[in-house]
């Protein structure tokens, strides 16, 4: 006879799964806030900075009532993938000025990647429909100047911070509806 069967496989508690995702998101939110503050200290922002290639804001007070778990996770994953690509681009093409943000920018990239894998796992554990593979995104043009790289960094970190902030709020809300 073979080895005795192991304990019955317990299906994951969705609230606990969501809890750990919230913790990771909160942690990344704090990291992003610190890095954005570091950037502001080194290169003060003059006014607001935008980057057309960044995703548009997906959540607001008005949208909270209609939130559904599959939609939130799919959209959050898509937006964070875009931010991951922008952070990678920033590290590669941002210029020597932004080298002063290393190793923090590298750590942020690794943690963002980890959160994305966590979201993917959460979607499969909750048996949510998996999004189709992402189409290859057009390459991001290198910044036109050193100052262009700094402006892009302000836009990327500011947008990521705002996205994560709403993500925590949305995920906390969804947890109460499970």
């Amino acid at each position: 006879p073979g080895p005795p069967p192991g304990p019955p496989r317990v299906s994951p508690d969705p609230r606990a799964e969501l809890d750990s995702t919230v913790l990771l998101t909160r942690s990344l939110l704090a990291d992003t806030r610190q890095l954005a503050a570091q950037l502001r200290d080194k290169f003060p922002a003059d006014g607001d900075h935008n980057l057309d290639s960044l995703p548009t804001l997906a959540m607001s007070a008005g949208a909270l009532g209609a939130l559904q778990l599959p939609g939130v996770l799919t959209r959050l994953r898509a937006d964070l993938l875009s931010y991951l690509r922008h952070v990678q681009w920033l590290r590669r093409a941002g210029g020597s000025s932004l080298k002063t943000l290393e190793p923090e920018l590298g750590t942020l990239q690794a943690r963002l990647d980890r959160l994305l894998r966590r979201l993917q796992l959460l979607m499969s554990r909750l048996a949510l429909p998996q999004p189709p593979p992402d189409p290859p995104a057009p390459p991001l043009a290198p910044p036109s100047s050193a100052w262009g790289g700094i402006r892009a960094a302000h836009a990327i970190l500011g947008g990521l911070h705002l996205t994560l902030d709403w993500a925590v709020r949305g995920l906390l809300l969804l947890k109460t509806r499970l």
Partner: antibody
Framework: EVQLLESGGGLVQPGGSLRLSCAAS????????MNWLRQAPGKGLEWVGV????????YYADFVKGRFTISRDNSKNTLYLQMNSLRAEDTAVYYC??????????WGQGTLVTVSS | QSVLTQPPSASGTPGQRVTISCSGS????????VNWYQQLPGTAPKLLIY???LLPSGVPDRFSGSKSGTSASLAISGLRSEDEADYYC???????????FGGGTKLTVL
């Protein structure tokens, strides 16, 4: 640097109207939900309402529903509070504040509204 | 009458640790993030703690927040004279569909 500057406060008679403005600068105004809050003299903070970043959704505290209206003009980076049918108990310092999620991360310095005959 | 309940006053001497409590219900603190604001005399409120225990940039780590069930607390260690202010807790309330505050706690540094 993020800045929020309220204006339009003053003395108004009960039953009267007033429109407050909040000029925003130093951030992408059209990305953020915006709120009005108030504080009666010597009292605590009270939330008045919120408007979504694109102006499509608004939530109000029960005590102002039907009397106060929040609006925004993203092209002018300005938030508004139209106050009608004012009462003595609406006397307060009114603040505008930015919301990136569940909290108010930047506040204006406030404008005083006095409702009295 | 405020939806969230805070003690009206608290006090401590310089260097001491003080804690301010905030209690609510499942529709606000129980299900939503708690935020804390500091209001120095004659000034606008300032965000002190968000999402229960996160510190915004520029807030010293002498300040900390925690939450358990339907209650939250703000702790200030190494108390300084400049910490003398009013402190407010806040959370979204699912039943009221709006933001609710505590009545505020006046902190005196003796």
């Amino acid at each position: 640097e993020v800045q929020l500057l309220e204006s339009g406060g003053g003395l108004v008679q009960p039953g009267g109207s007033l429109r407050l403005s909040c000029a925003a600068s130093g951030f992408t105004f059209s990305h953020y939900d915006m709120n009005w809050l108030r504080q009666a003299p010597g009292k605590g903070l009270e939330w008045v309402g919120v408007i979504s970043y694109d102006g499509s959704n608004k939530y109000y505290a029960d005590f102002v529903k039907g009397r106060f209206t929040i609006s925004r003009d993203n092209s002018k980076n300005t938030l508004y509070l139209q106050m009608n049918s004012l009462r003595a108990e609406d006397t307060a310092v009114y603040y505008c504040a930015r919301t990136p999620g569940s909290h108010f991360d930047y506040w204006g310095q406030g404008t005083l509204v006095t409702v009295s005959s | 009458q405020s939806v969230l309940t805070q003690p009206p006053s608290a006090s401590g001497t310089p260097g001491q640790r003080v804690t301010i409590s905030c209690s609510g219900s499942s529709s606000n603190i129980g299900n939503n993030a708690v935020n804390w604001y500091q209001q120095l005399p004659g000034t606008a409120p300032k965000l002190l703690i968000y999402y229960d225990d996160l510190l915004p940039s520029g807030v010293p780590d002498r300040f900390s927040g925690s939450k358990s069930g339907t209650s939250a607390s703000l702790a200030i260690s190494g108390l300084r004279s400049e910490d003398e202010a009013d402190y407010y807790c806040s959370a979204w309330d699912d039943s009221l569909n709006g933001v609710v505050f505590g009545g505020g706690t006046k902190l005196t540094v003796l």
